[in-house]
């Protein structure tokens, strides 16, 4: 399995963001597919569970992302993206997308560095 992400994402405090993660695999996508999203805060604290998909999507039942994340992927299109709602400044950090699609071997996790800002900075 190979994972593809945007690498970096900037979003405004209070808005929603789509964390895009796509993948490729030699094995057909079926019921064995799993997707796990985790988050590591900027202060380097312990990694936190964000989201899990296996046949159905599952939100975390506790923690900072409870009631603030939803599935926005489409496995048949090799898309494992999620939506993060109501962004806060302490959502700054690194998000990892891990896709397993047996019998294909596991690849490296995809990472997205999210920066939550006051206003979007437009580059020339």
């Amino acid at each position: 399995v190979e994972i593809y992400t945007s690498g970096a994402l900037e979003a405004v405090n209070g808005t929603d963001a789509r964390l895009k993660c796509t993948f490729s695999s030699f094995a057909p996508v079926g019921d064995a597919l799993t997707v796990t999203w985790n988050f590591r805060p900027l202060d380097g604290g312990p990694e936190q569970f964000v989201f899990y998909y296996h046949i159905d999507p599952f939100q975390p039942m506790s923690g900072r992302f409870k009631d603030r994340v939803s599935w926005d992927g489409n496995p048949e299109r090799y898309d494992a993206s999620i939506l993060l709602w109501k962004l806060q400044f302490d959502d700054n950090g690194t998000y990892t997308c891990q896709v397993k699609n047996p019998p294909d071997v596991d690849g490296l996790v995809g990472t997205i560095r999210l920066s939550v800002v006051h206003t979007v900075r437009f580059s020339e």
Epitope: T34, D43, F58, M61
Partner: antibody, heavy 116, light 106 residues
Amino acid sequence: QVQLQQPGAELVKPGASVKLSCKASGYTFTNYWMHWVKLRPGQGFEWIGEINPTNGGTDYNEKFKRKATLTVDKSSSTAYMQLSSLTSEDSAVYYCTIYTTALDYWGQGTTLTVSS
Amino acid sequence: QIVLTQSPALMSASPGERVTLTCSASSSVGYMYWYQQKPGSSPKPWIYVTSNLASGVPARFSGSGSGTSYSLTISSMEAEDAATYYCQQWSSNPPTFGAGTKLELK
């Protein structure tokens, strides 16, 4: 590294109340929700409830709603669980634990003995 | 609430033996956690969201399952694996734990 410090033991009389403490260090206290779990020998683990240290919001297992009250003191990075109207059924080991990718970090547990 | 039933309650395995511990849920759950506990110690996270090994867990461990049936497998038993293993679900509130499987070295 992450540490959750709990007193080793508490001895209290039936009908009394007790406030168990859990002092956190090695991480940003408000970044992770604190959970409390009960372990009675031969009866397995029971989840009591959780508290969001940022705003004090709580969620309890229905079974413990009238038994346990969870609070935090952000200034000292300490979580508390008060247990009221104690009976022998409350004698157990009580753990505090933080939720990260799972209940990943646990205190050593406080052994509560309710006895006259 | 969801009841988790672990089997067997007690199991003995020889070094090098393949070991499978099972956890059955009273209704369908989305994923499973597993914890290892040794006497006198706090539980340690062992497997999270069904199949992901916690930090420091040897690669001989694996987790699998879906719906109401989950398992933890040790491909080759080692002495240090002797412990009690608990499953825990948290795709439905309240989170619940199995009663544990005590794994002994034969």
